[in-house]
Interface confidence: low
Amino acid sequence: CSCSSLMDKECVYFCHLDIIWVNTPEHVVPYGLGSPRS
């Protein structure tokens, strides 16, 4: 799917197929957008 802005968190998390995904204990975050939240 085509994304809205990087502010559209749901889209960033579920639609950006070109982002490497990293699993954390709490949630999945897109690596490269910022440090995973603890």
Partner: antibody, heavy 121, light 112 residues
């Protein structure tokens, strides 16, 4: 009409703190991500930080990570930038700018007038 | 981060004459959705920046049609068809394809 008004700038000594505010009006503040962008005297524009529309996430340029914190109060239509451990190279005009809503890459469609932060002993 | 390089640094131009500013990116700005997220901003003396162009060639509302954007991939251009006195100031390109957003160093347009 969309309006963004920054405040809180001033002269501060190295190592001290300052909190900037950006009062928004003319749009549904809680639907938009918000950025801080700065401009050192005589220099170009540098993106500093961003906060999600709902305040759930924020990201920073490397040079301010661990020192600056962006936050927002959607009920007050206000964006904040808490600046700690200030350094001389943080001296700049700080602008708040709105992110586009549901349009990827639609950054900075509206800007405030800026507030000057001078870090000097 | 993507590096944005603008040229020239300074652009003296006579009133009524055309002006052209170049912007090059260190990586392609074509996103996977096919769009190219390249914006242009104007900063008049003593004022805050104002967005002129988004997605390479789309003018923001209220922007005169003498401003036009073009380009693709890594090479972009802002053209002013006939420079007016109010066009004096700094012009910045900015990419929004890759995170974080990055700006060019700016081009100063002045009247000669």
């Amino acid at each position: 009409q969309v309006q963004l008004v920054e405040s809180g700038g001033g002269v501060v000594q190295p190592g001290r703190s300052l909190r900037l505010s950006c009062a928004a009006s003319g749009f549904t503040f809680g639907s938009y991500g918000m950025h801080w962008v700065r401009q050192a005297p005589g220099k170009g524009l540098e993106w500093v930080a961003v906060i999600w529309y709902d305040g759930s996430d924020e990201y920073y340029t490397d040079s301010v990570k661990g020192r600056f914190t962006v936050s927002r109060d959607n009920s007050k239509y206000t964006l904040y930038l808490q600046m700690n451990s200030l350094r001389a190279d943080d001296t700049a005009v700080y602008y708040c700018a709105r992110d586009g809503y549901r349009t990827r890459g639609n950054y900075f469609d509206y800007w405030g007038q800026g507030t000057l932060v001078t870090v000097s002993s | 981060d993507v590096v944005m390089t603008q040229s020239p640094l300074s652009l003296p131009v006579a009133l009524g004459q055309p002006a052209s500013i170049s912007c090059r990116s260190s990586q392609s700005l074509v996103y996977s959705d096919g769009n190219t997220y390249l914006n242009w901003f104007q900063q008049r003396p003593g004022q805050s920046p104002r967005r002129l162009i988004y997605k390479v060639s789309n003018r923001d509302s209220g922007v005169p049609d003498r401003f036009g954007g073009s380009g693709s991939g890594t090479d972009f251009t802002l053209k002013i068809s006939r420079v007016e006195a109010e066009d004096v100031g700094l012009y910045y390109c900015m990419q929004g394809t890759h995170w974080p957003p990055t700006f060019g160093g700016g081009t100063k347009v002045e009247i000669k």
